[in-house]
Interface confidence: low
């Protein structure tokens, strides 16, 4: 038996909700890495980048025994980077695609830029509440990176408890259940 | 030191309403939920449900929704039970409870004293 | 809603004896996040119940050592190793793993 002060914080993506809901296509981008052809008249097979994309995403946070009251909506930095979209009131727009050639050693990719902390307050089935701080992305960027660079994957793992109300606090197995009966 | 002191004894006709109180004290009333339960003479014990105190918000068992309302009166960190209606059934020792931490994962721990509700014409 | 189930509903004891009582639940009590949020209680005349056991086998602050949980999904155990006099009483088990929050009938610890 062990009581201490450690809490991890798993997060479930519930429900992400697409920067332009009429388009189901936007969900696929976040599974696919982000990868999107412009619509613009353009030969489909000409693979020009709409612009980073911000997905933006609804979950409930979880510590494995009590939710968060209201979900938390953030973005989420989908995938790769190419050029700005060569629409056709661009300037420069016959240039574009040409310009941003992908070169076979660097790709773009489309990473968390800006981020801020948030308090949150989570519910336990008997009515208690926490507080956690959370940190959450606020702006996407692209970046360029070489071929051999890890990929650093986005971590909606990464919360820490704000200061606690009490000291003992269970610790929380890694488990990232749904369940929430837990009284 | 935790205490959560309890209203006394009452005895009410059947129809009548009945309201007990649960006075915390000790820790942070709005930090932990407020459970019910209820104890029929001679028998086991059944939970009734719980009031967030932070929020308010009531959530009752299967059994105890209707008739049955918790309040509470967070400036003076107390919970309240009300039983509208009262019926014979419902004579029986009404506990407050708290949990050991922030929820009842690591038990009930802290019990008021109970009050007894008696129903009777 | 789960079911917990206490063996026997009275144990008659001597003092010094050792003493068990079986509690089975309807359902698994492990909780996904592989805690299992059994507990034992007991309940003097005229008291309050006070918590003895939680999680299945911790004993809760100034709860003797004479008293130990054990078991796991649906089938556990309270034993009192040299039971007291001031042992005697209703001891219940409860289950916190699944809403609502349920106990044991209860089992009446007397002197034979």
């Known amino acids: 038996f062990k009581n201490d002060a450690t809490e991890i914080l798993y997060s479930h993506v519930v429900k992400p909700v697409p920067a332009h809901p009429s388009s189901n296509s936007t969900l696929n981008q976040a599974r696919n890495g982000g990868r999107h052809f412009s619509n613009t008249g353009l030969d489909r097979n000409t693979r020009v980048q709409v612009g980073c994309r911000e997905l933006r995403s609804t979950k409930y946070i979880s510590d494995g025994q009590c939710t968060s009251i209201s979900p938390l909506k953030e973005l989420v930095c989908a995938g790769e980077c190419l050029p700005l979209p060569v629409l056709p009131n661009w300037i420069g727009g016959g240039y574009g695609t040409k310009y941003w050639s992908r070169r076979s050693s660097q790709e773009w990719r489309c990473v968390n830029d800006k981020t801020r902390t948030q308090r949150i307050q989570l519910q336990c089935q008997d009515g208690s509440t926490r507080t956690y701080k959370i940190t959450v992305v606020t702006a996407c960027k692209c970046k360029r990176y070489t071929r051999q660079h890890n990929e650093s994957s986005h971590n909606f793992e990464s919360m820490s408890p704000a200061k606690p109300v009490q000291h003992h606090r269970e610790r929380k197995r890694a488990s990232k259940s749904s369940k929430h009966s837990m009284s | 030191q935790i205490h959560l002191v309890q209203s006394g004894p009452e005895l009410k006709k059947p129809g009548e309403t009945v309201k007990i109180s649960c006075k915390a004290s000790?820790?942070?009333?709005?930090?932990?939920?407020m459970s019910w339960v209820k104890q029929a003479p001679g028998k086991g014990l059944k939970w009734m449900g719980w009031i967030n105190t932070y929020s308010g918000v009531p959530t009752y068992a299967d059994d105890f929704k209707g008739r049955f309302a918790f309040s509470l009166e967070t400036s003076a960190s107390t919970a309240y039970l009300q039983i509208n209606n009262l019926k014979n059934e419902d004579t029986a020792t009404y506990f407050c409870?708290?949990?050991?931490?922030?929820?009842?994962?690591?038990?009930?721990?802290?019990w008021g004293q109970g009050t007894l509700v008696t129903v009777s014409a | 809603d789960v079911v917990m189930t206490q063996t026997p509903l009275s144990l008659p004891v001597s003092l010094g004896d050792q003493a068990s009582i079986s509690c089975r639940s309807s359902q698994s009590l492990e909780h996904s996040n592989g805690n299992t949020y059994l507990h034992w209680y007991l309940q003097k005349p005229g008291q309050s119940p006070k918590l003895l056991i939680y999680?299945?086998?911790n004993r809760f602050s100034g709860v003797p050592d004479r008293f130990s949980g054990s078991g796991s999904g649906t089938d556990f155990t309270l034993k009192i190793s040299r039971v007291e006099a001031e042992d005697l009483g209703v001891y219940f088990c409860?289950?916190?793993?699944?809403?609502?929050?349920?106990f044991g009938a209860g089992t009446k610890v007397e002197l034979k």
């Open positions: 409870v708290r949990g050991r931490e922030y929820y009842y994962g690591s038990g009930i721990a802290f």
């Open positions: 000790g820790f942070s009333f709005t930090t932990y939920g």
């Open positions: 409860s289950q916190s793993t699944h809403v609502p929050l349920t």
């Open positions: 999680k299945v086998s």
